[in-house]
Structures are given as structure tokens and as C-alpha cells.
Interface confidence: low
């Protein structure tokens, strides 16, 4: 037969197997003109692999317990006898009433996604039923699985889970929602409440619309031997051996111990559903015993031991050990010492491994000792305290507290501003502006250690040098930086901050704030020389405080202009001299001028300029200060707020008196006036005062 290339490409040529597993066919290739020699196409047939599922595919689980999946429940095999390690189950839809987990892996981890038949055989795949808050009699859950083992086709499987109080449960001897027993001090009475005995799960077997018409009837089949049961203060006896769930729920059942010893007591009962008007109805029932523990009223109470705070990072989980919660009680087993959460913090909750995912409010010392109790931190970063009550069931409950510290994953030292030290004081308190630690919140309990000290000073607390201090001391203004060496206008030091077990370092810069009064006033005229005097720069207060004459050193500027010393009188030889250093006395003597230049290379107009000065005085650190001023082209009609020693050349020409005065002519009579000279009478007054004097 002839087949074309296009038929092959189109997948239209099929091979149908029959007979032996090995075989094939011969073929030749031809393009119509040329024919190739013969070829053999070998075909090896493989037996088809089929997957099959055996086992009941149903699992019966006791309420609140963990049950392994077994080969009776789930048993996969393949026609090729595949290794169980290669038979893989994928969980398509997980359980709704519990969870599936691997015994060898963290039972608190994520939901199980896949597992092998070998793990089922080993009993490592566990279903855990989580107790719901509401009572139930029977509940059904399903797991949807997909079995795969290439090259076989996948097989879908459904595992049905029945959770029932009907089942005989070694882990849970009672078929009731609660049958915890009771403790009672010798010779005393105790109420039996639904916290100790509760058959509301029997009621849950009735459809909810009819539930209110039903009750559970308890029939006492064997009475307590050392005490008496009372319902609404009426004793139960052989002639009246019944009480109801509704009476239990209303707190009407009481056990009164008769005294004379601390032997165990209890009663046996049968519980079954009761229909409307007391009619007996078909439904779940159980026969059980209720244990009553009689305690010696003089027994020694448990002694709580000192507790170490639990520390963990937010969002994590940490086990609670005896370091956090333990008691000394020679006459109680760990399982008898019960804790109840009175108040929980907002930063997380307590959980029991195997006790469901939610928070627990009751647990025992045995839970702590076995490592089953853990704290689960939520996203909150605040510390918190559990207030607990602890009882051995005989003594009055005792208060205990469990502190939980949430550790930050990282902290940051915030430096909002350098520390400014007033020049005359030479010392200043640190504040939150300089040092403040934040993580995901403020850390008011941060501690600091000096890892690189300042060069020119000390850090002091209480007047004494220190290398360690706290945020609290900073906030109280107790941490002081003091200059000890008066040679620098700045300093720095490095600290290591520690908050809740995490550290970070930071550098604090220290600068000296000059004790200098600076008044630049309005704009200053370009091309003019103005007088620098205490109306512009004044370190008089520093002079008084240090009993010395403060000195200025010009560090920088002005960019357009210069500071000059002006001659005392016309007779004094020479013009103005460039100045780099001057004193407060020079300012007070009116010996200094500032030649305000014009910015070059651009059209005339307003501009800005500044002087940077270093101010020195005896016994205090130097400080850097700046005098910032605005300039504008000279305006003859404008009153300027400083004394002008000269005005621009052009302005004098306009006034009709060319060459009347040198640019830095001597100060006239007005120069000593504390008020600005030009401002007094405008331009003509200035000319009168300065040119015709």
C-alpha cells in the first residue's frame, strides 16, 4: 500500500498492534522518479499500565482526634506492580472539617499537597479533626485525590471521612460532648455544669427545627457512694433517678459531699434523647460514668515559679516551656494543673499542637511540659501580658502572668537634627531630635552604647562621663554633651543602639550654635560700601558671658564684594584694607565696611550673597555663623536700613558732585548714629552728612 508524506504529517497513518510484542514493517521511499532501498520500521509494544484503587475509601475518625490513613482505607496498585513510592496522590480538594498532614513533618505547617502510597502504608499520612465550637453528633468530610504514576492514566479518588461520637474511641472514652468529671473539696458542695458534663451533641442529632422540643434524659444507674446528687436542691434517689440536659445547662445539678474522707466518688448514668412531652425517641444514647474527685481541703496549694518572658519576632511561633510557666505542686500531676486565660494580649494567641488552629483559653501544665503549647504572634509589634489563673482543682485559683516580648526584625536609629550646643554654655542635652529608635513602632526602651567617643567633649549623665545610656534618660534630658576642648566648632560620636534584642549604629553630629545676633535687614545696594557694626553683627552677649573680646575669622564670601577696614580719618594714610579677621571691638568702633559688589556676567538685578564667619571667644568652643543678605542695584530713592559709607560712582555723578568722595570715604557725623544714616533723610541727607561734612 502507498501512503503519502502529507498523510503521515497529518497523523492519518496508524499502527494497530496484534500478535507478538516485537515486530514491525518494511517500507520503501519514492518520489515518483527515484525509489530508495528497503527500510525496516521496528515496533515494540508495551503492556498497558492500569492503576486501580482498592480499600474502603472511607475513614472513621473520633471527634477532635488524629487518625492515620491506612491500606484498609486507601490502597493503590498498578498492573505493572509499580513501587508504592511511585504511586503518587495529589490532594485536589482538602478536608473541610480538619486537615491532612505528614507525621514526620511540622504538623503546624502548610496543608499537605501530595503523598505516596508508601507513606500511607507507613502510617505517616494523618487526618486531624478540628473540634468545632458547636456540638454535633456526626459530621462528614471528603477529600478529593488524584492518583498518578506515569505512563498510566491518572485516576480520581474520593476519600469519605465520617466523624462520629458513635465510634468507640480509645482517645475519647466518652460519647458525650463533655464528660470531664468534677473536683470537690471534702465535705463541700459543687455545681455540675455543662463545663463538666454536656450531652448537647446528642441533641445535635435532631434536625435544628425540632431541636427545641427535645431534651436529653440522664438516668442515674448507680448513685454516688460518698455524697448526694441534687436537682434544684431536691435529692435524686432510686425513686427519682432522672435529670435533664436543660437542668444541667441551667446549673441546677449539684453534688454534695458527705465528708469523712477523700476517696473517689462518682455516679453511673444512661443518657438518651427525649422527645416532645417526655416521649422516648429513637436516637443516639450512651452509658457512662461521671468521676468525682474529693480533695483534702488542707492540701498544699501549687506554688507558681518565676517566669521568664517569651521572646519572638512578630508573625512567628514559639513554644512555651517551663521557663515561662511552671508550678511546684507535690500533690498534683501536671495534667491536673490547669491554666485559664483571663486576659490575652493583642499581639497573638496561645495554641495547642493537635488542638486545632485557633486560640486556646485552657491548657494544663502537661501541655507546657510536653512542648504542645505555643504562642503564635500576629503582625502586632507590641509586647503583651497574658493574665492567667492557675488551679490544681483543689485550691483557689492563683494569678499568674506570662509576658510576651515581640522582637523587631530590624531597628533604625532616627537622627532628625544634629545636636546644637549653645556657644557660651559649651554643653547641651540630647533629645529625641538626635536619637530615637524605631522598628515598626517607636522603641522607648532602647539602650545606647558609645562605640566611638567624641574628640572634643564628653557625654555625661548626672554630671559624670558615661559610655552607656537609655532612651528614657534621653527623653528626660539627662544625657548631656559637653565640650572639654575649645578648639573645634563641631564634633561627632557613634553609638550602638539596642532595642528588644536587635541593634543598629548611628553617628550623632554636634555643632556649636554661635552666640551672635545677626540683622541683615532689607536688601543692600550693589556698588555701595556699608558699615559693618553691631547693628548688623553683634557678639556683645558672648563678650559679656566670656569676659573677653570675641574674634571673627572670615571663612568664606562674600562672592561679590569684600570686607574692608576703613581709615579712621581723612588724614589717615591709605585706602581701605582687605580684612580676614576682626573683633567685636572693630565692629563697635565702626572700623569695618562691606563693599557690596555687582554680580558679573548678567543683567543688573536683585541677587543674594553671604559671609561665613568663625566666631571665637575665650574658654568656649568656636562657632560657625553666616550672614545672609540680599542685594539690588542702588536706588537713590530707597531708604536703606544700614549706614552707607559710600554709594556707587554713577549715583554720585547723578547728584552733580563728581569726585566728591572716595568710594570708601571716612564715616561722617551720622556714622556713629545707631539709626541707619540713609534712612533718616534720603539721598540728599546722606550727601550732606558724608560729602560736605
Amino acid at each position: 500500500r502507498t501512503r503519502s508524506g502529507s498523510q503521515l504529517d497529518g497523523g492519518l497513518v496508524l499502527f494497530s498492534h496484534r500478535g507478538t510484542l516485537d515486530g514491525g514493517f518494511r517500507f520503501r521511499l519514492s518520489d515518483g522518479e527515484h525509489t530508495s532501498p528497503g527500510h525496516f520500521f521496528r515496533v515494540t509494544a508495551q503492556k498497558q499500565v492500569l492503576l486501580s484503587l482498592k480499600g474502603s475509601q472511607t475513614l472513621t475518625v473520633c471527634p477532635g482526634s488524629v487518625q492515620p490513613l491506612s491500606s484498609q482505607t486507601l490502597r493503590a496498585s498498578s498492573s505493572a506492580g509499580t513501587d508504592p513510592q511511585l504511586l503518587l496522590y495529589r490532594v485536589v480538594r482538602g478536608p473541610q472539617l480538619g486537615r491532612l498532614f505528614h507525621a514526620q513533618q511540622d504538623s503546624t505547617g502548610e496543608a499537605l499537597v501530595n503523598f505516596t502510597q508508601a507513606e500511607v502504608y507507613a502510617g505517616n499520612i494523618l487526618y486531624e479533626h478540628e473540634m468545632p465550637p458547636e456540638p454535633f453528633w456526626e459530621a462528614h468530610d471528603t477529600l478529593e485525590l488524584q492518583l498518578s504514576s506515569p505512563p498510566a492514566r491518572d485516576v480520581a479518588a474520593t476519600l469519605a471521612v465520617a466523624v462520629s461520637f458513635e465510634a468507640a474511641c480509645p482517645q475519647r472514652p466518652s460519647h458525650l460532648w463533655k464528660n470531664k468529671g468534677l473536683w470537690v473539696p471534702e465535705g463541700q458542695r459543687a455545681r455540675i455544669t455543662v463545663a463538666a458534663l454536656d450531652a448537647s451533641n446528642l441533641l445535635a442529632s435532631v434536625p435544628s427545627p425540632q431541636r427545641s422540643e427535645h431534651d436529653v434524659l440522664f438516668q442515674v444507674t448507680q448513685f454516688p457512694s460518698r455524697g448526694q446528687l441534687l436537682v434544684s436542691e431536691e435529692p435524686l434517689h432510686a425513686g427519682q433517678p432522672h435529670f435533664l440536659q436543660s437542668q444541667l445547662a441551667a446549673g441546677q445539678l449539684v453534688y454534695a459531699h458527705g465528708g469523712g474522707g477523700t476517696q473517689q466518688d462518682g455516679f453511673h448514668f444512661r443518657a438518651h434523647l427525649q422527645g416532645p412531652a417526655g416521649a422516648s425517641v429513637a436516637g443516639p444514647q450512651t452509658s457512662e460514668a461521671f468521676a468525682i474527685t474529693v480533695r483534702d481541703v488542707n492540701e498544699r496549694p501549687p506554688q507558681p515559679q518565676a517566669s521568664v518572658p517569651l521572646r519572638l519576632t512578630r508573625g512567628s511561633r514559639a513554644p512555651i516551656s517551663r521557663a515561662q510557666l511552671s508550678v511546684v505542686d507535690p500533690d498534683s500531676a501536671p495534667g491536673e494543673i490547669e491554666y485559664e486565660v483571663q486576659r490575652a494580649p493583642h499581639n497573638g494567641f496561645l495554641s495547642l499542637v493537635g488542638g486545632g488552629l485557633g486560640p486556646v483559653t485552657r491548657f494544663t501544665q502537661a501541655d507546657v511540659d510536653s512542648g504542645r503549647l505555643a504562642f503564635v504572634a500576629n503582625g502586632s509589634s507590641v509586647a503583651g501580658i497574658f493574665q492567667l489563673s492557675m488551679s490544681d482543682g483543689a485550691s483557689p485559683p492563683l494569678p499568674m502572668s506570662l509576658a510576651v516580648d515581640i522582637l523587631p526584625s530590624a531597628i533604625e536609629v532616627q537622627l532628625r537634627a544634629p545636636l546644637e550646643v549653645p556657644q557660651a554654655l559649651g554643653r547641651s542635652s540630647l533629645s529625641q531630635q538626635q536619637l530615637r529608635v524605631v522598628s515598626d513602632r517607636e522603641e522607648p526602651e532602647a539602650a545606647y552604647r558609645l562605640i566611638q567617643g567624641p574628640q572634643y567633649g564628653h557625654l555625661l549623665v548626672g554630671g559624670r562621663p558615661t559610655s552607656a545610656f537609655s532612651q528614657f534618660q534621653i527623653d528626660q534630658g539627662e544625657v548631656v554633651f559637653a565640650f572639654t576642648n575649645s578648639s573645634s566648632s563641631h564634633d561627632h560620636f557613634r553609638v550602638l543602639a539596642l532595642a528588644r534584642g536587635v541593634n543598629a549604629s548611628a553617628v550623632v553630629n554636634v555643632t556649636v550654635r554661635a552666640l551672635l545676633h545677626v540683622w541683615a535687614g532689607g536688601p543692600w545696594p550693589q556698588g555701595a560700601t556699608l558699615r559693618l557694626d553691631p547693628t548688623v553683627l553683634d557678639a556683645g552677649e558672648l563678650a559679656n558671658r566670656t569676659d573677653s573680646v570675641p574674634r571673627f575669622r572670615l571663612l568664606e564670601g562674600p562672592r561679590h564684594g569684600r570686607v574692608v577696614r576703613v581709615p579712621r580719618a581723612r588724614t589717615e594714610p591709605g585706602g581701605s584694607q582687605l580684612v580676614e579677621q576682626f573683633t567685636q571691638q572693630d565692629l563697635e568702633d565702626g572700623r569695618l565696611g562691606l563693599e557690596v559688589g555687582r554680580p558679573e556676567g548678567r543683567a543688573p538685578g536683585p541677587a543674594g550673597d553671604s559671609l561665613t564667619l568663625e566666631l571665637w571667644a575665650q574658654g568656649v568652643p568656636p562657632a560657625v555663623a553666616s550672614l545672609d543678605f540680599a542685594t539690588e542695584p542702588y536706588n537713590a530713592a530707597r531708604p536703606y536700613s544700614v549706614a552707607l559709607l559710600s554709594v556707587p560712582e554713577a549715583a554720585r555723578t547723578e547728584a552733580g558732585k563728581p569726585e566728591s568722595s572716595t568710594p570708601t570715604g571716612e564715616p561722617g557725623p551720622m556714622a556713629s548714629s545707631p539709626e541707619p544714616a540713609v534712612a533718616k533723610g534720603g539721598f540728599l541727607s546722606f550727601l550732606e552728612a558724608n560729602m560736605f561734612s
Epitope: Q342, A344, P399, M400
Partner: antibody
Framework: QVQLVQSGAEVKRPGASMKVSCKAS????????IHWVRQAPGQGLEWMGW????????NYAQKFQGRVTMTRDTSTSTVYMELSSLRSEDTAVYYC??????????WGQGTLVTVSS | DIVMTQSPDSLTVSPGERATINCKSS????????????LAWYQQKPGQPPKLLIY???TRESGVPDRFSGSGSGTDFTLTIDSLQPEDSATYYC?????????FGQGTRLEIK
């Protein structure tokens, strides 16, 4: 029976510190919290904080944080409350009270502290 | 902080009658985990320390006469004193013991005519 006996009245200058004691008897000292509550003349009750005599753990009201220190001496079943940087508004009767967690079942007789210059 | 507000500030009642004092908290003091209201009532007579009457909103402290009863849930609570006796003349305080700082109401002065 349960007894909490407090130290006697004190007069203090502003800025000074005071230390009031509270001696417990008639019960197991380490099993119950001791709280401090104060009452200014003619005013209501104000909770200051608690100490767990067993562990020494404390919890102070924010208002007194940094000024109050509560300590205990288990050998003498005594709790102490120290308040520093006193101001005139700290003039009050200071009570110690025993509790199971958070309500105050037994109280000391009270200690009047007067802050005056 | 939880703010406790009592009403009235004072009341005068004749012997043998009933007195009712109200207390309101700025947030619920019901602990949903154990369904208990963390509220206590105290009685204080001049020159004496306060005396515990009621805790958990309605549980009477042992030795307290059953004329005293507490009720309420969440944020609204009432102390009721039936058949008033002359010795009931005192100031009554409510206190939340749900969360620190534990806070008291401003007090209600009860006078017997």
C-alpha cells in the same frame, strides 16, 4: 485572716521621694497580686499598678511610669511602693490591695502622704 | 484607657427602699472567651478603705449581704441595693478589671434619709 498593714503617715517636700510599705499576713504571700491605689482628698480612686510577689513582675499605669517603683521582700511578706519627684498633687491616701488577677478583695488601712513646701 | 462613668453623682433614699447606681464603660468589658464581664463594685465609708461587694459584674463577694446585687453586660452595669439599711450610707465605686490601667468610676454618694 487576711491582713495588709501599711506604714505610717508621711510629710514630704516637693521633689522628694516617698516609700510606703505593705506587710501581708494570713495567706500565702506569693500567690496573690498586690496593687496600689491612691485617693486624693475628697476625690475618687486611682489605680497605680501591680506587682506579682512571686516573680517580682510589675505593671504600672502610664501616668506613673518612670516615677513609681514597686518591689517586694518575700522573706518578710512585704511589698514596697516608691514614688519619686513628688508634687503637691501627689498628696493622697495610698492603699495597697490584694487581688486574684484584677479585683481588689482585701485592702490595707491606707497611708496618708502629704506633699507640702 | 477605659473610662468609667457613674450616675447619679449622689442620691438620697429612705430606709427600706431600693437604690440603683449605674455605671457605663467607654468600651465593652465583656471577655468573649469566657463570657464574663470584668466589672467590680466597691463600698467606701469615710476614713476607711474600700470594700469589695461584687466582681464579674454579678458575683457577690462572700460575706456581702444578698441585698446587694449587680447586673448588666458589655458597657452598661447596675448596682442595686434592696431594702436599704442606715449602714449602707457610703460612696460606691465601679471598677473595670478587664484591662490595665484598671479604672474606677468617679463614685456615687448614697445618703440614707
Amino acid at each position: 485572716q487576711v491582713q495588709l498593714v501599711q506604714s505610717g503617715a508621711e510629710v514630704k517636700r516637693p521633689g522628694a521621694s516617698m516609700k510606703v510599705s505593705c506587710k501581708a499576713s494570713g495567706y500565702t504571700f506569693t500567690n496573690y497580686y498586690i496593687h496600689w491605689v491612691r485617693q486624693a482628698p475628697g476625690q475618687g480612686l486611682e489605680w497605680m499598678g501591680w506587682i506579682n510577689p512571686n516573680s517580682g513582675a510589675t505593671n504600672y499605669a502610664q501616668k506613673f511610669q518612670g516615677r513609681v517603683t514597686m518591689t517586694r521582700d518575700t522573706s518578710t511578706s512585704t511589698v514596697y511602693m516608691e514614688l519619686s519627684s513628688l508634687r503637691s498633687e501627689d498628696t493622697a491616701v495610698y492603699y495597697c490591695a490584694k487581688s486574684w488577677v484584677s479585683w481588689f478583695a482585701s485592702w490595707g488601712q491606707g497611708t496618708l502622704v502629704t506633699v507640702s513646701s | 484607657d477605659i473610662v468609667m462613668t457613674q450616675s447619679p453623682d449622689s442620691l438620697t433614699v429612705s430606709p427600706g427602699e431600693r437604690a440603683t447606681i449605674n455605671c457605663k464603660s467607654s468600651q465593652s468589658v465583656l471577655n468573649s472567651k469566657n463570657n464574663r464581664n470584668y466589672l467590680a463594685w466597691y463600698q467606701q465609708k469615710p476614713g476607711q478603705p474600700p470594700k469589695l461587694l461584687i466582681y464579674w459584674a454579678s458575683t457577690r463577694e462572700s460575706g456581702v449581704p444578698d441585698r446587694f446585687s449587680g447586673s448588666g453586660s458589655g458597657t452598661d452595669f447596675t448596682l442595686t441595693i434592696d431594702s436599704l439599711q442606715p449602714e449602707d450610707s457610703a460612696t460606691y465605686y465601679c471598677q473595670q478589671h478587664y484591662s490595665t490601667p484598671f479604672t474606677f468610676g468617679q463614685g456615687t454618694r448614697l445618703e440614707i434619709k
